[in-house]
């Protein structure tokens, strides 16, 4: 049904869905704080631009009795229930912030006439790709996939002279929401990653993973997994690992690797960590002081969602354009806006672009060091350490298939 929007005559409201099922187990109070901090900034920016308008947020809470698992896998209906609640109350803002679970976002997008923009801190899955009025402010699975394929093919760096075309993927089903969808995308037979690889097998049992580490008949030396170092240690422990094994640990939303006093444990020496470039000012900002390094990005995405709305509102008001139009709903893409922690770029499909950072453990210093960075906006690699102090032979990443010999030349032109 068509719900009237509180979105005109100098008063602009943001509907924030506060769902029990969430991509990260973040207390809703922290998300409220992030939204409120964002509102303060937006009001200031609009005022500085000479726009005398009111911007507020309405927090819509779902029924905790029905949706209380906190688990995204059971979130399919929660978003729709909240939309129904909004519809009944005739209380829709100019923009919807939330949900963060892929299932609920997909379902809401499918089952509603979305004539308003939807901003999500999450919705990582491939099923939420290419949605015309959906904006995602945390790196979706598609961006990870493009990095991995790019890195696999690379063979013109002094530390990576072999193209790779194989991989194991460890996925046991207990992953966090972001990891679940990242690995799901790698597993999907129709995905870009699967299409570009010649061999890919999903390991679902701990024992399968552990056996591969020393299996002389393994079909690939490369294993992708998702989570933090502790997750890897639980699985790998202090087991011996063949010298040409490379573990790619996807841990995007974790700043801890960049903290000054962090030393890499010994079990990380065969591991390349893929994470995001850390923010500058988040460590001592008021809203993030109580947040763990992992959850900072989630709360920040809510805050940036507010700033994005403020950015678009300012542009439309300055141009004298109507906010409750399809044009506004479709405008939240292919742009750069001033986020809380610097510029934020959205691609043509409204997905956030970022700088991914690939780290290795220096055998000299036992510190995490940057090997290269990757700009998802231009799909470009920027080498950083041209002579890394790797654990691998000759300070080069090994071939992905043992015994394939000096076959460097899988050229991709």
């Amino acid at each position: 049904s068509q719900v009237s929007q509180n979105c005109h005559n100098g008063s602009y409201e943001i509907s924030v869905l506060m769902m029990g099922n969430s991509a990260f187990a973040e207390p809703l109070k922290n998300l409220e704080d992030a939204v409120n901090e964002g509102l303060e900034i937006v009001r200031g920016r609009l005022q500085n631009a000479g726009l005398n308008v009111t911007v507020n947020a309405t927090f819509m809470y779902s029924d905790g009795l029905i949706h209380n698992s906190g688990d995204c896998r059971s979130s399919t209906c929660e978003g729709l229930d909240l939309l129904r609640k909004i519809s009944n109350a005739q209380r829709m803002g100019c923009v919807l912030i939330g949900p963060s679970c892929t299932y609920s976002t997909f379902q809401m997008y499918l089952d509603t006439e979305l004539s308003y923009p939807m901003i999500s801190a999450g919705s990582f899955g491939l099923s939420c790709d290419y949605k015309e009025t959906l904006t995602r402010l945390m790196s979706p699975a598609r961006k990870l996939m493009y990095f991995l394929v790019n890195f696999w093919k690379t063979n013109d760096l002094p530390f990576k002279t072999y193209s790779w075309s194989t991989s194991y993927v460890y996925k046991n089903g207990t992953e966090t929401e972001d990891c679940f969808w990242y690995l799901n995308a790698l597993e999907a037979s129709v995905s870009y990653f699967s299409h570009e690889l010649g061999f890919k097998v999903v390991l679902r049992q701990d024992k399968e993973f552990q056996d591969i580490l020393m299996d002389h008949n393994r079909k690939s030396n490369v294993i992708i997994m998702c989570g933090g170092p502790e997750f890897l240690y639980k699985l790998k422990g202090d087991r011996a690992v063949a010298e040409d094994i490379v573990i790619i640990l996807v841990d995007l939303f974790n700043d801890q690797y960049f903290e000054d006093n962090v030393t890499a444990p010994d079990y990380m020496k065969n591991v390349l960590v893929l994470t995001l470039s850390p923010g500058n000012s988040l460590l001592n900002s008021s809203f993030s002081r109580n947040l763990s390094p992992t959850k900072r990005d989630f709360a920040l995405a809510y805050l940036n969602g507010i700033l994005l709305f403020g950015h678009m509102l300012k542009i439309f008001l300055e141009n004298g354009e109507n906010i409750t139009t399809p044009k506004f709903a479709h405008a939240f893409r292919n742009l750069t806006f001033e986020g809380y922690d610097g510029p934020v770029t959205l691609d043509d499909w409204g997905d956030v672009d970022s700088t991914m950072v690939l780290l290795y453990t220096s055998v000299d210093t036992k510190k995490y060091k940057v090997l290269l960075t990757y700009d998802t906006h231009v799909n470009k690699t920027y080498p950083v350490d041209m002579s890394p102090t790797f654990t691998w032979k000759n300070s080069k990443l090994p071939n992905d298939i043992t015994g394939r010999g000096p076959q460097h030349h899988h050229h991709h032109h």
Epitope: D156, L157, V370, T373, Y382, S387, H408
Partner: antibody, heavy 118, light 106 residues
């Protein structure tokens, strides 16, 4: 357009030090590695080292590890290379060269001539 | 370190000639890079990743090769092509350059 402008020619006595600068413009300085290359009279080009301005990571050619020190000032978009304990064999033209992977050394400075003579 | 040997060191040719310069590596490399340098000037990136022409390089230039043998070819030499050409590898650390091939007017 991309430009790398190096400091002027230097004449130094043996045992002295010299610091060569390379000011970058026309691109984001911290986005690209900066290399230093030596060209001695009648000799082939020799790569000395590379620095990543964003992270400060520096890799030296072992041959020049005790000779060259590479630094940068990101606020001035400038890379520096200091040569210590100068000897006559350090007489050469020194170039800075930017990386734009996969095109290594895609732009070069005009070169700085360092002459070591007593 | 990987040694690169260029041949010939000197090459006399006339405008319109087809010219081939070779670069041999002491061990196998994936790609070769080429630079042009004129007297009194700094080197310029000319060909990267074996066969890709750098920005502004005329299409009469081409690069090819694999393993230890690489070539730079000028299909029809022009007056502005008289210069010294260097090959370079970054397959192994540190990157190394060839000794150069000076292309002179006959």
């Amino acid at each position: 357009e991309v430009q790398l402008v190096q400091s002027g020619a230097e004449v130094k006595k043996p045992g002295a030090s010299v610091k060569v600068s390379c000011k970058a413009s026309g691109y984001t300085f911290t986005d690209h590695n900066m290399n230093w290359v030596k060209q001695a009279p009648g000799q082939r080009l020799e790569w000395m080292g590379v620095m990543n301005p964003k992270f400060g990571t520096i890799n030296y050619n072992q041959k020049f590890k005790d000779k060259a020190t590479i630094t940068r000032d990101t606020s001035a978009s400038t890379a520096y290379m200091e040569l210590s304990s100068l000897r006559s064999e350090d007489t050469a033209v020194y170039y800075c060269a930017r990386d734009d992977y996969p095109n290594y050394f895609d732009y070069w400075g005009q070169g700085t001539t360092v002459t070591v003579s007593s | 370190d990987i040694q690169l040997t260029q041949s010939p060191s000197f090459l006399s040719a006339s405008p319109g000639d087809r010219v081939t310069i070779t670069c041999s590596a002491s061990s196998s490399v994936n790609y070769m890079y080429w630079y042009q340098q004129k007297p009194g000037s700094s080197p310029k990136s000319w060909i990267y990743r074996t066969q890709n022409l750098a920005s502004g390089v005329p299409s009469r230039f081409s690069g090819s090769g694999s393993g230890t043998e690489y070539t730079l070819t000028i299909s029809s030499l022009q007056p502005e092509d008289f210069a010294t050409y260097y090959c370079q590898q970054y397959h192994d650390y540190p990157p190394t350059f060839g000794g150069g091939t000076k292309v002179e007017i006959k």
